[in-house]
């Protein structure tokens, strides 16, 4: 978790002088509780936006927006703590809005936004906005949280972001797999425009079962420049096992930008359709 272009973070708006600060996610109002604390945020919204860095890279960011409740507690509102928790790693990043002037009621509802938390493809986050100071022990909570899932690199709009392109999202191998005679599979895919090797991972399964009955790995050497964007054809020999008929072919590239952590593409061949009631084979052949 990180912030995008850390230098230019602003939270001031007409009628409010405000500064954005790094936060340890442990505001001192936990340790030194105040008697009077503000109410919780209202209408917290988390949206996926896209932002460019100064270097021109495009990143997905969490756009956080909330409003204040129209009660007198805004007189005691000193700021807000914004926290983003990545759920699969428990990594947390916080920033603090520090109000340098007192809030006053005005004709419009106060609204705050922040769009600088960089999020990763296919990751889930819990976003929390805590009004400060935090409540006294056993006081009513004054935070709001929402969970938010970022689409993966297959998503059309995510595909062109820098983290997705770095993991090979622009490569479309257009895999085709056909079953040949004599227990063989013919795999065909389009090479990318990079002199890097590939690996074909074949996993076979019995019909309607998920434990594999055959596994095979095939190495494809780095293509020459004249072979870029051309089709590569590979014939894989299967183990002659009755019922080991569902095949998953996965192609793993080793692009320089993602090495052995590149996006993999796969295709599946289903077991051949079985007739519902097989025709009985007679023991003898009538001669008429």
């Amino acid at each position: 978790l990180r912030l995008l272009d850390h230098r230019a973070l602003v939270c001031s708006q007409p009628g409010l002088n405000c500064t954005v600060k790094n936060s340890t996610c442990l505001d001192d109002s936990w340790i030194h509780p105040r008697n009077l604390t503000p109410s919780s945020p209202k209408d917290l919204q988390i949206q996926l936006h896209f932002a460019h860095t100064q270097q021109g890279d495009l990143f997905p960011v969490a756009h956080i927006e909330w409003t204040l409740q129209t009660d007198a507690s805004i007189l005691y509102l000193e700021g807000a703590e914004l926290s983003v928790l990545q759920l699969n790693t428990n990594e947390r990043l916080c920033v603090r809005f520090e109000f340098l002037s007192k809030l006053r009621h005005h004709h419009r509802r106060w609204r705050f936004t922040f769009s600088h938390f960089v999020v990763d493809p296919d990751q889930e986050y819990e976003v929390t906005v805590h009004h400060l100071p935090k409540p006294i022990p056993d006081g009513d909570p004054n935070h709001q949280s929402k969970n938010f899932l970022v689409p993966d690199c297959e998503h059309a709009r995510m595909k062109v972001t820098t983290p997705c392109m770095s993991s090979g999202s622009l490569w479309d191998p257009n895999i085709t797999v056909e079953t040949l005679e004599a227990h063989q599979l013919r795999v065909s895919f389009t090479l990318w425009n990079e002199s890097t090797h590939y690996q074909i991972l074949l996993t076979s399964f019995p019909h309607m079962e998920n434990h594999s009955c055959f596994e095979h790995m095939h190495h494809i050497p780095a293509p020459r420049p004249e072979e870029f964007h051309q089709r590569s054809n590979v014939t894989l020999t299967l183990r002659n096992l009755k019922g080991c008929c569902r095949h998953q072919v996965q192609i793993q590239p080793f692009f320089s930008s993602c090495l052995n952590d590149c996006l993999r593409h796969s295709a599946t061949v289903s077991c051949p359709e079985m007739p519902d009631t097989p025709e009985p084979i007679p023991d003898y052949m009538p001669l008429w």
Partner: nanobody
């Protein structure tokens, strides 16, 4: 112009099933997460279920978990809600809603919706 049109509602006996559909147009359907939200007579809006853009993630309110199934067909630009073991308390106007941004609100407190359908009425009564 974004349009969401629900269908499939009606009067059904408790314990029976119903399948709601929502036909979408006017936006790139397979870019966005979609949700079902309901409003029982005299009550507020209640989020029922949501599904991510590629069906990779689905979420359900506790009150419908195990009975309702959300699905989508991106090629047909359609969202579905299969409702089984219906109860009287499922009686409501069911709305299809589009998530306002490309992410997916994966918790139960979802309200990031920018477009709604007109709703389809489901009445569960014997």
């Amino acid at each position: 112009r974004v349009q969401l049109v629900e269908s499939g509602g009606g009067l059904v006996q408790p314990g029976r099933s119903l399948r709601l559909s929502c036909a979408a147009s006017g936006f790139t359907f397979d870019d966005y997460a979609m949700h079902w939200v309901r409003q029982a007579p005299g009550k507020g809006l209640e989020w029922v279920s949501g599904i991510s853009w590629n069906s990779g993630r689905k979420g359900y309110a506790d009150s419908v978990k195990g009975r309702f199934t959300i699905s989508r067909d991106n090629a047909k630009k359609c969202l579905y809600l299969q409702m089984n073991s219906l109860r009287a308390e499922d009686t409501a106007l069911y709305y299809c809603a589009k998530e306002s941004s490309l992410g997916y609100c994966s918790g139960g407190s979802c309200s990031n919706f920018d477009y709604w359908g007109q709703g389809t009425l489901v009445t569960v009564s014997s």
